[in-house]
């Protein structure tokens, strides 16, 4: 970099060469050059020569101003030049930036995705600081007192094993860089609430051919979690709006919902789980497309009364349109 | 041919409970096709409310989740709809339907409902 | 909700005359449907996946339409067109219906 320089004087930056994005800053160089007055004195930002804002100090320094300082990153020098010399001799370089002091981190949130082994912690950042900002997660223990604190530069992972107090914690974030340091608030986990259930799959569908063709999906999860509350959604590709139903699941067995879907029309469908009655649930799973098949013939008045409607149906994917749950209406 | 006849009270009191009944002939409910309620409220406006398809699932519309109920008894080919708690926002003709792929293709001749104390 | 706006609410044509109405989602969807109502009778399906009409309609309607914007065409109003008609889409769940376009004989 530019500060790695073997330096014939030097260059500092006020107020700092860290500092809040939008500031005036003032930049000088001092030349101390063997056996030279300098007749005049240049400033380069990112090695573009810049020809407004400089002043001479004295005769050996120069200040050049900038107002509303925006650019996250510059490398600035300077340079003499020296009487019976053809080229500028280097002064000095330093790397300048600008940025923001962190926002107070929100949203604070800790899970265990099933099998994993670790607790993840994340949090909403705030605003882009554009410098350097270190994140501290204190995990206290709220049985034993007990305080760890994790270092990171985004969210963090910590073992299961590590945490040793027992089950109820409290979590809390500190952030911190050059203009300032900020703190969450305190988060308090139950170890047993912040499960993610394994993740769910939508594996495949079929249509079956019937009066109202139905698709059907299967879907699964390697969960050992007894009770599991899931959600598919599901719309037409060229839909914005999605469909949402929602089911009580046992993954003792392969999932298998129902839809009744408009013919011709690609379709995607994803499905989420988590545990009933908590929090946290699963990123949705990725995209499922399904084209379902064209059941539009031309029809007849026999033919619309009776059940010739519908084309024969073959289906290796899946769609959606309705969706329908396992609650029966029958009587007996 | 598809007929579906309907019955059930004219008046219902607030706070009570609707009950109407679909009775199909020249088709089993079993055999395919959805079976569903709607009801057209006096201002004309039409509003789906749910069905229970041929294998006895339903699907109800999400503004009546949570006190509608569509049932079957299959030994008759009738399907059933109970509305609790009725207000007089539920005064509306009811009607019940088959339903296909996106649309209704047989209608009930429709029951006019009041709710009334 | 998708909410289905139908225009004019009421309109009149004469005998002979071509009648255009509209059906606007408001979100896209996949097809329309369409439902005539004469006074104190049960809708009847009219037109379904947008251009099909359905049995026993007469050659004279037709359908078009896709994403947000639908219509019903009467090339050429007969007196038995008198009626009120209704969109309806099915591609999201609640299926929601417009509030209707009230044909009338000029």
């Known amino acids: 970099g530019i500060t790695n320089i073997n330096c014939s004087g030097h260059i500092w930056v006020e107020p700092a060469t860290i500092f809040k994005m939008g500031m005036n800053i003032s930049i000088y160089c001092q030349a101390a050059i063997k056996n030279c007055q300098p007749r005049k004195l240049h400033f380069y930002k990112n090695g573009i020569k810049e020809r407004f804002q400089i002043t001479r100090i004295n005769k050996t320094t120069a200040r050049l101003w900038y107002k509303n300082f925006l650019e996250p990153h510059a490398s600035m020098y300077c340079t003499a030049e020296c009487p019976k010399h053809f080229q500028e001799t280097l002064i000095c370089g330093k790397d300048i930036s600008s940025g923001y002091p962190p926002d107070i981190p929100d949203e604070v949130t800790c899970v265990i995705y099933e099998y994993s082994g670790n607790m993840t912690c994340t949090w909403n950042a705030g605003k882009l600081t554009y410098i350097d900002t270190k994140y501290v997660v204190h995990v206290k223990s709220l049985e034993t007192e007990e305080e760890q604190q994790y270092l990171t530069s985004s969210y963090i992972n910590i073992s299961t094993d590590s945490l040793q107090g027992g089950k109820k914690y409290l979590v809390w974030v500190q952030a911190a860089n050059a203009l300032g340091m900020e703190e969450s608030k305190q988060l308090q986990i139950h170890l047993d609430d912040i499960v993610i259930p394994s993740a769910a799959v939508i594996s495949r569908a079929e249509t079956i051919n019937a009066t109202v063709p139905k698709t059907i999906i299967y879907w699964d999860s390697q969960t050992t979690i007894e009770k599991v509350s899931c959600e598919m959604r599901y719309k037409a590709t060229t839909n914005q709006t999605w469909n949402v139903k929602e089911f009580d699941t046992n993954f003792t067995y392969v999932q298998q919902s129902e839809f009744y879907l408009e013919p011709n029309i690609k379709y995607v469908f994803q499905v989420r789980c988590q545990e009933t009655g908590k929090r946290y649930w699963q990123p949705w799973s990725s995209l499922f497309f399904h084209k379902t098949p064209e059941t539009v013939p031309q029809v007849t008045s026999k033919a619309f009364q009776h059940d010739t409607w519908n084309s024969g149906l073959t289906v290796a994917s899946i769609s959606t349109g309705h969706l329908t749950s396992d609650n029966r209406g029958d009587i007996g | 041919e598809v007929q579906l006849q309907q019955s059930g009270p004219g008046l219902v009191k607030p706070s009570q409970s609707l009950s109407l009944t679909c009775s199909v002939t020249g088709y089993s409910i079993t055999s395919g096709y959805f079976w569903n309620w709607l009801r057209q409220f006096p201002g004309s406006k039409l509003e789906w409310m749910g069905f229970i398809d041929n294998d006895g699932s339903n699907d109800y519309n999400p503004s009546l989740k949570n006190r509608i109920s569509i049932t079957r008894d299959t030994s008759k080919n009738q399907f059933f709809l109970r509305l609790n708690s009725v207000t007089t926002e539920d005064t509306a003709t009811y009607y019940c339907?088959?339903?296909?792929?996106?649309?209704?293709?047989?209608w009930g001749p429709g029951t006019t409902l009041t709710v009334s104390s | 909700d998708i909410v289905m706006t139908q225009s004019p609410a009421i309109m009149s044509a004469s005998l002979g005359e071509k009648v255009t109405m509209s059906c606007r989602a408001s979100?896209?969807?996949?097809?329309m449907y369409w439902y005539q109502q004469k006074s104190d009778a049960s809708p009847k399906l009219w037109i379904y996946y947008t251009s099909n009409l359905a049995p026993g309609v007469p050659a004279r309607f037709s359908g078009s339409g896709s994403g947000n914007s639908y219509s019903l065409t009467i090339s050429s109003m007969e007196g038995e067109d008198a009626a009120t008609y209704y969109c309806?889409?099915?591609?999201?769940?609640?299926?929601?219906f417009g509030a209707g376009t009230k044909l009338e004989l000029k």
């Open positions: 309806q889409q099915f591609t999201n769940s609640p299926w929601t």
């Open positions: 979100s896209s969807v996949n097809y």
């Open positions: 339907a088959r339903g296909r792929l996106g649309f209704f293709d047989s």
